[in-house]
């Protein structure tokens, strides 16, 4: 997300088209309360930050109010009056989307439709990973909207189940987020568990002829 | 507000390229927001195209992604269309607009210019 | 592609009625729909954008509604400058698309 400036690294977050997170890691300045200064405009002054991050009592980061923009972030970090990293950036393309909400499930004998609430935005894939005790890996599964249905399940399985959003590269560039996990959730005999076993009971030897 | 208006020929023979300005003022083309062009065929169909990002990343409906190029001279606050191999179903009125990603409907339009694909 | 199917291709009704236009999508798209009034010679409009969000400046008897597959935008005491017709659109995926109009005669 941008070289660094006098050993300054940066990450941009645009939470769910909401709020812009820019957190820094200055080495050289680690003891030192940098200032965040921004603009929406380029002919426009520049605001100073006014909700800070700290890590360890000193200024890591800010986050602003920037409601569904499609613009630039143009920022300057400083010590004292002195930049220590001036850049621009479009904060669409550092897109993080909100985790899944109000996740359900709906089964239908070896079949099962995950729902949840949409987002209020689009070119977005929301994937359902699953998993067995006696799967190795999560398969998954995704859609445009947040109706995925998996089938071909064993109904006298266990299956874990998580969902996350992701931004469509294709319109968002590659420096997005997929948004964080839901909770797991376990499922068996379309009935909802605590957990998966996670060592599943080894199959019978089969006897040699 | 930010205005848009197109320009170009009005008529474009069969197989030649179709070429479209569109020139924006009292906004930056390279500040934000997506510049998409949209037609409007005979009989009011309307059809998406493409379109150039503030950032200069472009998108095309992939109908049309062999022909198609969308392309911005910033110097001059314009972007353009350019659609190859024409044939007479390219006949619509042309739109240039503005939206945004994420939130894809268009805000603001121009006035649209006919483009009439014949011999 | 997501086809936006708009069935009635022309409603007739009268100045101060309620008109409702609807917009059928071929597959859910949440509420990334918009809609535009064009009227007659001149560019689309947006009227409605995530559904049901008025878009600025748009008179508050324009209304929209739905979300999924089934949207509707509601027009309450129809004017005469209503005369038009109405598009809907989808954003949830690109190809964004439209649907095919419905034209609003005023008797």
């Known amino acids: 997300q941008g070289g660094a400036a006098e050993g300054v690294q940066i990450q941009i977050i645009y939470f769910n088209l909401e709020t812009v997170q820019v957190t820094w890691n200055a080495s050289k300045y680690s003891r030192t309360n940098l200032t965040f200064h921004y603009r929406f405009n380029g002919d426009e002054a520049y605001d100073q930050c006014t909700n800070y991050l700290l890590q360890e009592g000193h200024t890591s980061g800010c986050l602003l109010d920037a409601e569904q923009r499609d613009d630039i972030l143009y920022f300057s970090i400083r010590n004292g009056t002195h930049p220590v990293f001036t850049a621009s950036r479009w904060m669409v393309y550092y897109l993080k989307p909100s985790s899944p909400k109000h996740v359900r499930f709906s089964w239908h004998q070896d079949a099962v439709t995950v729902t949840c609430s949409d987002l209020s935005y689009g070119d977005l894939l929301y994937e359902v990973q699953y998993r067995s005790p006696f799967d190795t890996e999560w398969q998954s599964k995704q859609e445009n909207t947040c109706n995925v249905t998996i089938e071909g399940l064993d109904a006298e399985k266990c299956y874990s189940f998580w969902v996350r959003v992701k931004a469509m590269e294709d319109v968002y560039g590659p420096d997005t987020y997929p948004s964080d996990w839901s909770e797991v959730t376990c499922w068996q005999r379309g009935e909802i568990r605590d957990a998966c076993a996670e060592t599943p009971t080894p199959p019978k030897p089969k006897l040699s002829k | 507000d930010v205005q848009l208006q197109e320009s170009g020929p009005d008529l474009v023979k069969p197989s030649q390229s179709l070429s479209l300005t569109c020139t924006v003022t009292n906004y930056s083309i390279t500040s934000g927001y997506s510049w998409p062009w949209i037609r409007q065929f005979p009989g009011n169909k309307l059809e998406w195209l493409g379109y150039?990002?503030?950032?200069?990343?472009?998108n095309y409906n992939p109908s049309l992604k062999s022909r198609i190029s969308i392309t911005r001279d910033t110097s001059k606050n314009q972007f353009f269309l350019q659609l190859n191999s024409v044939t007479p179903e390219d006949t619509a009125t042309y739109y240039c607009a503005r939206s945004q990603l994420g939130l894809v409907f268009f805000a603001y339009w121009g006035q649209g210019t006919l483009v009439t694909v014949s011999a | 592609d997501i086809v936006m199917t708009q069935s009635q291709k022309f409603m007739s009704t009268s100045v101060g009625d309620r008109v409702s236009v609807t917009c059928k999508a071929s597959?859910?798209?949440?509420?990334?729909v918009a809609w535009y009034q064009q009227i007659p010679g001149h560019s689309p409009k947006v009227l409605i954008y995530s559904a049901s969000y008025r878009f600025s400046g748009v008179p508050d008897r324009f209304t929209g509604s739905g979300s999924g597959t089934d949207f509707t935008l509601t027009i309450s005491n129809v004017q005469s400058e209503d005369l038009a017709e109405y598009f809907c659109?989808?954003?949830?995926?690109?190809?964004?698309?439209f649907g095919g109009g419905t034209k609003l005669e005023i008797r």
């Open positions: 150039i990002h503030s950032s200069g990343r472009t």
């Open positions: 659109q989808q954003y949830n995926s690109y190809p964004y698309t």
């Open positions: 597959q859910s798209v949440g509420a990334n």
